[in-house]
Interface confidence: medium
């Protein structure tokens, strides 16, 4: 979690925030937190509320994707008078409350980040004692997960007329640039497909016609690193098969 900027449309920061006699509901979250895959990231969330000295039962919730309706990834509950928020849900055991809801802090830590965690998260607090009230961040915090390239698949496939084509699929954020090298190729970007819908971190490059036997190498590179993998083409000349 690298860069964080405050969302001024959602964060009503002012010097009277702790002393105002009639505090309104507000939530302070940064619009974006950036972190690298494998790291732990913290999603900050603090709030103000109009119920002075509220000490009743409360529930802290984080959801992903969209406010109010997105799936919950974390939930904890604190009993009346208790500062301990007992975890009731932590998706895959990777979400942990760092803030103290009694101190108006719902900050959450996400462990072992993966590219799939790259989405928007929304914090919510619910009061359920003498006071029944709730509030949820509307804009949320976008967790931007970056990752060095990783080649997830490289293969040689038959194509019409006894020809062969090579496919290389890599993931990373920023989406990696792919390049093929091989016999009589030099260094070719080949036919690079845009990231697929629903697979925004995956990029595929195709070599439509492999004309020579030998080793074909796919290289994926972005600002965080590079990765390469190779596939071998050896055709049994005079036969229709190939060994890869």
């Amino acid at each position: 979690f690298v860069r964080t900027k405050i969302d001024t449309t959602e964060n009503l920061l002012n010097t009277e925030v702790h002393s105002s006699p009639a505090q309104r509901w507000s939530m302070q979250v940064p619009p974006e937190v950036s972190a690298e895959a494998g790291d732990a990231a913290v999603l900050p969330c603090t709030f103000t509320h109009p119920h002075r000295h509220y000490d009743g039962p409360l529930t802290a919730i984080w959801r992903a994707g969209e406010p109010y309706a997105g799936p919950q990834v974390f939930r904890c509950a604190a009993a009346r008078g208790s500062e301990l928020c007992q975890t009731a849900l932590s998706l895959h055991g990777r979400f942990r409350l760092l803030g103290n809801p009694r101190r108006n802090d719902l900050s959450l830590r996400v462990e072992r980040l993966a590219l799939a965690d790259d989405r928007r998260y929304f914090c919510r607090v619910e009061f359920a004692g003498d006071v029944h009230d709730r509030y949820e961040s509307r804009h949320g915090v976008r967790l931007h997960v970056t990752a060095a390239p990783r080649i997830v698949n490289i293969s040689v496939l038959p194509s019409p007329a006894h020809a062969f084509r090579a496919l290389c699929t890599a993931e990373g954020e920023p989406p990696p640039a792919l390049a093929w090298s091989g016999p009589a190729l030099g260094n070719s970007l080949a036919a690079v497909r845009s990231p697929r819908e629903g697979h925004g971190h995956l990029v595929t490059a195709e070599l439509p016609a492999l004309t020579h036997d030998g080793r074909y190498t796919c290289t994926a590179a972005n600002s965080l690193g590079r990765s390469e993998a190779s596939v071998y083409l050896f055709r049994f000349h005079g036969a229709s098969g190939a060994s890869t």
Epitope: F1, N11, V33, V42, L98
Partner: antibody, heavy 123, light 107 residues
């Protein structure tokens, strides 16, 4: 009482790997995180990395490609490795305790510090 | 990254004077600010967290205030033992960043 002590070679050659150890006492690495911070001579402070109580890590992205942090809870030690060093890595390196690791607030402060160890990068 | 701009970089004051140091963040940091004191040849010492909360054992002449992007550290009555460099640090956003420091000397 809480104490942290950095140790390691005071001189490292350019392009080599700097290795430092922080030995702690008065608290358990199972319950507290540890930061590494450095300070070039006559300059300000630069945060490097935090290892949380459960072993998770959070790095300064500007240094992450060269930094490795690990810990041995049973030995009360946290180690830092910085690869491919240059003269710009000459600094006093501090380890410091992260005080609110376990559910009392996301406060990235450093409440206890070691005395620091000077590492000079020179051939 | 959030930049922390501290001023002045150095100051000289008399014993008993009121000393004020300011720290400006390049973006809102929601009061998640700490102040440290570093005496020559020593490690930094945490004085204040949460922009205003004095750490246990820190003399009450030290105080902090501010909100949003602008924060202030005050020594109400400078003492000889306060000769040091003072740093602010934000922890709202990783990477954690420090101000450039303010060196306080006695006239």
């Amino acid at each position: 009482q809480v104490q942290l002590q950095e140790s390691g070679p005071g001189l490292v050659k350019p392009s080599e790997t700097l290795s430092l150890t922080c030995t702690v006492s008065g608290f358990s690495l199972s319950n507290y995180g540890v930061h590494w911070v450095r300070q070039p001579p006559g300059k300000g402070l630069e945060w490097i990395v935090l290892i949380w109580s459960d072993g998770s890590t959070t790095y300064n992205s500007a240094l992450k490609s060269r930094v490795t942090i690990s810990k041995d809870t049973s030995k009360n030690q946290v180690s830092l490795k910085l690869s491919s060093v240059t003269a710009a890595d000459t600094a006093v390196y501090y380890c410091a305790r992260h005080p609110y690791d376990d559910y009392s607030g996301y406060y990235y402060t450093m409440d206890y510090w070691g005395q620091g160890t000077l590492v000079t990068v020179s051939s | 990254d959030i930049q922390m701009t501290q001023s002045p970089s150095s100051l000289s004051a008399s014993v008993g004077d009121r000393v004020t140091i300011t720290c400006k963040a390049s973006d809102h940091i929601n009061n998640w600010l700490a102040w440290y004191q570093q005496k020559p040849g020593k490690a930094p010492k945490l004085l204040i967290s949460g922009a205003t909360s004095l750490e246990t054992g820190v003399p009450s002449r030290f105080s902090g205030s501010g909100s949003g992007t602008d924060y202030t550290f005050t020594i109400s009555s400078l003492q000889p033992e306060d000769i040091a460099t003072y740093y602010c640090q934000q922890y709202w956003s990783s990477p954690l960043t420090f101000g450039g420091g303010t060196k306080v000397e006695i006239k």
